[in-house]
Amino acid sequence: MPLLLLLPLLWAGALAMDPNFWLQVQESVTVQEGLCVLVPCTFFHPIPYYDKNSPVHGYWFREGAIISRDSPVATNKLDQEVQEETQGRFRLLGDPSRNNCSLSIVDARRRDNGSYFFRMERGSTKYSYKSPQLSVHVTDLTHRPKILIPGTLEPGHSKNLTCSVSWACEQGTPPIFSWLSAAPTSLGPRTTHSSVLIITPRPQDHGTNLTCQVKFAGAGVTTERTIQLNVTYVPQNPTTGIFPGDGSGKQETRAGVVHGAIGGAGVTALLALCLCLIFFIVKTHRRKAARTAVGRNDTHPTTGSASPKHQKKSKLHGPTETSSCSGAAPTVEMDEELHYASLNFHGMNPSKDTSTEYSEVRTQ
């Protein structure tokens, strides 16, 4: 799990105007919005005898800064004011007294784009290294969370689904996880980079989406992944099958992945018919769906109660009326745009209350 996105070092050991003062830093670094990067940096300066015992202060400034007016974006000088928009996100991680000017950027934002220069001060020795400068490029966040489904999803049986963002860095602001599901859910434990959703699927959750949304509040950027729950009927040796979808939302049965102890095509056809009948009943009995929002320390808390017991009613579309049979796969990671997870029935009949509960669970 990469804690810091370290790019290949494009070392630029260019000499500054005064050959006694030099600095080595990569000239360009790229970081995705919301993520972080550590930029290694080394500098050298002559030390006159009268400044030997003076503390070394280092500063990173935006290009074009006027030293006597502009605040730096980062510094190790405790009483020095820094730029408001970089406070807590830009850190002079290196120790200037050891000639280290390494810069750490967390929760990268679009407006961090630009060039930066380093300045050192040691007593009366002061120098701004105008060359080389560090050019920071902040790009779109392309990483997306992974959803992990362990084993088989069975109606009435609780399972822990994990949404993880292993590519995020430890130093950044912990992301806010939001789960969106039509199935009955509750919140499990979470770590800095993962959230667990306890799901208890029902027969009518066939075809519904389950979304894990991750917001990096430090940068105000959001990424998500959606999987689709696909109900299947396997009377014995129940298993779960996961099919990567093409993002179109259409479901399909793929040849070569249909497994199960079903003797003969006729039985299969009969079961498929039964399944269609079940979902016809589900559709006709569907009532108003309930949407529950559970917020915990969210920057944008949802309205309504913080308990799933008190649900806010809202009209939502129920599950789609399509079916497919699927086969085996134990623990699976979701990595495509849209996926199909199967729910296996053990000859169960749908309960009389077949309304869809559509809940969103937010975690932070």
Partner: antibody
Framework: QVQLVQSGAEVKKPGASVKVSCKAS????????ISWVRQAPGQGLEWMGW????????KYAQKFQGRVTMTRDTSTSTVYMELSSLRSEDTAVYYC???????????????WGKGTTVTVSS | DIVMTQSPLSLPVTPGEPASISCRSS???????????LDWYLQKPGQSPQLLIY???DRASGVPDRFSGSGSGTDFTLKISRVEAEDVGVYYC?????????FGQGTRLEIK
């Protein structure tokens, strides 16, 4: 010859906001700083804040913190000063002034705009 | 904040005579580079202020040589060797060493 051209006079009601512009004609001002200084009728000069049009860095006087916002548009060589929650005491002439620097050496506010009169009255 | 104090606040002068304005700062305006970050400005009636002196003693371009600045640390003086009618207005000293930038109260020079 560098000139700072300011927007026209404004009359505002208490509680409203005003946004004054200051456009540099001639050489671009991106290697300088722009200070905003106001002068109430019959009073002295009062510094409100400063913006570096190149870095975008700003510094505001404590008195105006939270009420003043200074921004810049480098494509048009224009800086803006917005003052919110106006009160009658904000009635003044607002000047933008170019602060000239060479490296770390300060050369004073060598170019001033003609001023924008802002009247706050109900 | 650095407090700037000017004296006198009013200065009536006969044309051709010298004039002197004093400015005192609450803390030293001497920068680590050896220069004093003190300016003098003149605001003529109905006009914007104009820079006369920067870095304590350097004359701005276009400023007549009858204007001179002196002093260091906390005590500064603006001298006009021979006052002319066009010199009337309010003179301000200003420290540019640190923000917030602060001005003196102003000295009104008028012709007797």
């Amino acid at each position: 010859q560098v000139q700072l051209v300011q927007s026209g006079a404004e009359v505002k009601k208490p509680g409203a906001s005003v946004k004054v512009s200051c456009k540099a004609s001639g050489n671009t001002f991106t290697s300088y700083g722009i200070s905003w200084v106001r002068q109430a009728p019959g009073q002295g000069l009062e510094w409100m804040g400063w913006i570096n049009p190149n870095s975008g860095g700003t510094k505001y006087a404590q008195k105006f913190q939270g009420r003043v916002t200074m921004t810049r548009d480098t494509s048009t060589s224009t800086v803006y000063m917005e003052l919110s929650s106006l009160r009658s005491e904000d009635t003044a002439v607002y000047y933008c002034a170019r602060e000239s620097w060479f490296g770390e050496l300060y050369y004073g506010m060598d170019v001033w705009g003609k001023g924008t009169t802002v009247t706050v009255s109900s | 904040d650095i407090v700037m104090t000017q004296s006198p606040l009013s200065l009536p002068v006969t044309p051709g005579e010298p004039a002197s304005i004093s400015c005192r700062s609450s803390q030293s305006l001497l920068h680590s580079n050896g220069y004093n970050y003190l300016d003098w400005y003149l605001q003529k009636p109905g006009q914007s202020p104009q820079l006369l002196i920067y870095l304590g003693s350097d004359r701005a371009s276009g400023v007549p040589d009858r204007f001179s600045g002196s002093g260091s640390g906390t005590d500064f003086t603006l001298k006009i060797s021979r006052v002319e009618a066009e010199d009337v207005g309010v003179y301000y000293c200003m420290q540019g060493l640190q923000t917030p930038i602060t001005f003196g109260q102003g000295t009104r020079l008028e012709i007797k």
